[in-house]
């Protein structure tokens, strides 16, 4: 029962996480115009992975797609790639995990096959979550670097006569959505891997076979093994996974400063 709950919860958490990764990837507010310590403008700029937008105080919003591929910064391309890989892996993981769910019966699928599929989807979710977190973090790092660069030369004078204002960008809502979604997908993946252990068939105890050799009676009783999981005994692994679950919770960190503008 606990295994089914863990697997089901892992699936739901991953589903929410992947939906969040898709939402973050599509969102326009990856970077937003920094309003702190800036001249107050009647125009608000924000940018996504696919287009940049301008919202006027009047309410009129205009978005323009990045219609060039070669002219875009390599970092932006890398972030796009990471997010897309995350989505694709996550989607495949979801598909695999649907068939792996213990509550769903498909023909005469053995528990060992379900365990394998659960583990596969779990790993896919973990990699998907890591891709999303990596993508968002790369973009955030890019923003921080550009922010301080533009702060250093915020006003560039032309002969001391005319001042031109450089627009600074800060973290947009999509970054926080991406971080949280990536974390959820990662946690869901870990839960699927934990559930995999309980799904594997129980130890097969073979009948003892006695071998008689020159008056000595030696009985060999081979211990059972978990099919295709590649792990040791059940109790030992349970301890490892419990520890793993705690570690994931501790490692998962959320931004302490929400820099919305």
């Amino acid at each position: 029962m606990a295994v089914t709950a863990c697997q089901g919860l892992g699936f739901v958490v991953s589903l929410i996480g992947i939906a969040g990764i898709i939402a973050a990837t599509c969102m326009d507010q990856w970077s937003t115009q920094d309003l702190y310590n800036n001249p107050v403008t009647a125009v608000f700029n924000y940018q996504g992975l696919w287009r940049s937008c301008v919202r006027e105080s009047s309410g009129f919003t205009e978005c323009r797609g990045y219609f060039t591929l070669l002219g875009l910064p390599a970092m932006l391309q890398a972030v796009r790639a990471l997010m897309i890989v995350g989505i694709v892996l996550g989607a495949i993981g979801l598909l695999v995990s649907i068939f792996a769910l213990k509550c769903i019966r498909i023909g005469s699928m053995e528990d060992s096959a379900k365990a394998n599929m659960t583990l596969t989807s779990g790993i896919m979710f973990i990699v998907s979550g890591l891709c999303a977190i990596a993508g968002v973090s790369v973009f955030a790092n890019m923003l921080v670097t550009n922010f301080w660069m533009s702060t250093a030369n915020m006003y560039t004078g032309m002969g001391g006569m005319v001042q031109t204002v450089q627009t600074r960008y800060t973290f947009g809502a999509a970054l926080f959505v991406g971080w949280v979604a990536g974390g959820l997908t990662l946690i869901g993946g870990v839960m699927m891997c934990i559930a995999c252990r309980g799904l594997a068939p129980e130890e097969t105890n073979y009948k003892a076979v006695s071998y008689h050799a020159s008056g000595h009676s030696v009985a060999y009783k081979p211990g059972g093994f978990k099919a295709s999981t590649g792990f040791g005994s059940n109790t030992k692994n349970k301890k490892i996974y419990d520890g793993g679950a705690r570690t994931e919770d501790e490692v998962q960190s959320y931004p302490s400063k929400h820099d919305y503008v």
Epitope: V40, A42, V43, N45, V54, E56, S57, S58, G59, R64
Partner: antibody
Amino acid sequence: EVQLKESGPGLVAPSQSLSITCTVSGFSLTNYGVSWIRQPPGKGLEWLGAIWAGGNTNYNSALMSRLSIRKDNSKSQVFLKMNSLQTDDTAMYYCARVGYGNSFANWGQGTLVTVSA
Amino acid sequence: DIVMTQSPSSLTVTAGEKVTLSCKSSQTLLNSGNQKNYLTWYQQKPGQPPKLLIYWASTRESGVPDRFTGSGSGTDFTLTISSVQAEDLAVYYCQNNYFYPLTFGAGTRLEIK
């Protein structure tokens, strides 16, 4: 057809407050912002402030302390209130609908406010 | 606050002439996000409220005759009337629509001989 019409008291005593109503038709205040502008006789234009579609406001920093703009979407009315009027506040007061580029696309005919004892 | 400087302060021309009105801002009105200049031109005829002519520095408002053309970028802007008509007698104002407070130029008075 977009229309804006200002209605005010005409004459205000010094140190008193001014209240002007701008009644709009042909557009909704939930979709468009409205700005207030004034023009002293024979002089140039001065932006006072604006109330945007979402209800947020911006004011001219020089007048912020004595200026207040609010609106009633259901009645299609925008209200300007200005405190502690002096003689140099005598002007034609206009309300205008904000359009593309934050420009003032449509203007009311204006209401003349004279500050005098 | 952004200072908008218009020149000349007044101008007398004959009908059919080409007229160029200048407007300079103390800071750039060009928004990097959409590469648009947030400068507006208005025409105010005697006894009337101002009328919108040009927004985004060069976009003509619907219904405005095509003899009115806006140009310029950053801090220097121009309103050109290709062939002045008698009905163009008015004061022309430029406005900063980028920075708060939204400021107007002092205006250029156009008179017809």
